[in-house]
């Protein structure tokens, strides 16, 4: 054996953002021929010996960080990248608006503003079709998301979520969609 066994992949299907009471499947995938998997929920001391975890109805207690490994012979693989499973719909939806407005000229600037009546300190913005949240290096997880020098690629449908840093995997319902039009 030269070097550690390669890490498996861990994914959530259909998405790692799961509305409460909706189903989700966590799947750990290693090399062909591997059948001994361990799927762990971090910070909970628990694990199961299967590659697939089917959750028929998402609960608050199932939100959190997951990781998996596999065993080949007596050797363990490197762990997968952590998967963050988020329960959405735990709190009421925030509102999403665009300043100065949802129609913006190419090359112009726009700021997407996520507002909630709760005292949340964290916000996530998603663009429809993108699996990962919109990340602005300066203002990730803030209430406002400035988009400097808008291009046609920025046009699309956006939604935001709000949550607390104390419970980072329990999110609000998504805001109503906001259509950003680049002219």
């Amino acid at each position: 054996q030269s070097g550690p066994l390669p890490k498996p992949s861990l994914q959530a299907l259909p998405s790692s953002l799961v509305p409460l009471e909706k189903p989700v499947t966590l799947r750990c995938q290693g090399p062909p021929g591997v059948d001994l998997y361990r799927l762990e929920k971090l910070s909970s001391s628990r694990y199961q010996d299967q590659a697939v975890l089917f959750i028929p109805a998402m609960k608050r207690s199932l939100a959190g960080r997951y990781r998996c490994s596999y065993q080949n012979g007596s050797l363990w693989s490197l762990p997968s990248d952590q998967l963050e499973l988020v329960a959405t719909g735990v709190f009421a939806k925030p509102s999403l608006s665009a300043q100065p407005g949802p129609a913006v000229s190419s090359g112009g600037d726009v700021t997407l503003q996520c507002q909630t009546r709760y005292g949340f300190d964290q916000f996530a913005l998603y663009k429809e079709g993108d699996p990962a949240p919109y990340k602005n290096p300066e203002r990730w997880y803030r209430a406002s998301f400035p988009i400097i020098t808008v291009t046609a690629a920025h046009s699309g449908t956006y939604r935001c979520y709000s949550f607390s840093s104390r419970d980072p995997y329990l999110w609000s319902a998504p805001s109503d969609p906001l259509e950003l039009v680049v002219t």
Partner: antibody, heavy 123, light 112 residues
Framework: QVQLVESGGGLVKPGGSLRLSCAAS????????MSWIRQAPGKGLEWVSS????????DYAASVKGRFTISRDNAKNSLYLQMNSLRAEDTAVYYC????????????????WGQGTLVTVSS | QSVLTQPPSVSGAPGQRVTISCTGS?????????VHWYQQLPGTAPKLLIY???NRPSGVPDRFSGSKSGTSASLAITGLQAEDEADYYC???????????FGGGTKLTVLG
């Protein structure tokens, strides 16, 4: 109530072999991970080996790998530890311990322990 | 040499509060694994005292509490009683080879 009773300990010469057994009762044995944990005289606890509920997942401490073999017989509600090539430093009380389980999840801690069986390796 | 580090001994007078620390690394406690604590009274097998960093099994008095932060954890005992005199062990899991790891143990002496 949950009971774990170890047996098979005794005096053995260096290089010799011994087989420990742990008889489990009062719970569904086949649902739980099980481990052997040892404690040298006057020293702390050292995890030795664990086996998954179906006997597929097996792990050993580096200090015993290649010399000790853990196994289980779910039909007999029994856990075993075959110890070969014994050394003086293997002298210890050997405990059988159950891992907590809830629904489909196993947990990384031990909720019940046996009273232990003493293994002495000496010439 | 234990993977998790505990002080060899602590002591306190009856009624006092004592804490026992448990320090690990980024491959065990810092890798998202919880810390569990066991009490071993003289001449007996270990008994689960705290699981999942801060949870008490039924029957364990609320004088015992646990916490975890980063790569370390601690066990606090308030209102010390003579029957608390025992060895205390922390335990976690290590990601490297999926092994269970213990601290070296701490002997608690109740003075007087």
């Amino acid at each position: 109530q949950v009971q774990l009773v170890e047996s098979g300990g005794g005096l053995v010469k260096p290089g010799g072999s011994l087989r420990l057994s742990c008889a489990a009762s009062g719970f569904s044995f086949s649902d739980h991970y099980m481990s052997w944990i040892r404690q040298a005289p006057g020293k702390g606890l050292e995890w030795v080996s664990s086996v998954g509920s179906e006997g597929k997942f097996i792990d050993y401490a580096a200090s015993v790998k290649g010399r000790f073999t853990i196994s289980r017989d779910n039909a007999k509600n029994s856990l075993y530890l075959q110890m070969n090539s014994l050394r003086a430093e293997d002298t210890a009380v050997y405990y059988c311990a159950r891992h907590y389980r809830e629904f489909r999840w196993h947990y990384y801690y031990f909720d019940y322990w046996g009273q232990g069986t003493l293994v002495t390796v000496s010439s | 040499q234990s993977v998790l580090t505990q002080p060899p001994s602590v002591s306190g007078a009856p009624g006092q509060r004592v804490t026992i620390s448990c320090t690990g690394s980024s491959s065990n406690i810092g890798a998202g694994y919880d810390v569990h604590w066991y009490q071993q009274l003289p001449g007996t097998a270990p008994k689960l005292l705290i699981y999942g960093n801060s949870n008490r099994p039924s029957g364990v008095p609320d004088r015992f509490s646990g916490s975890k932060s980063g790569t370390s954890a601690s066990l606090a005992i308030t209102g010390l009683q003579a029957e608390d005199e025992a060895d205390y062990y922390c335990q976690s899991h290590d990601l490297g080879a999926h092994v269970w790891v213990f601290g070296g143990g701490t002997k608690l002496t109740v003075l007087g």
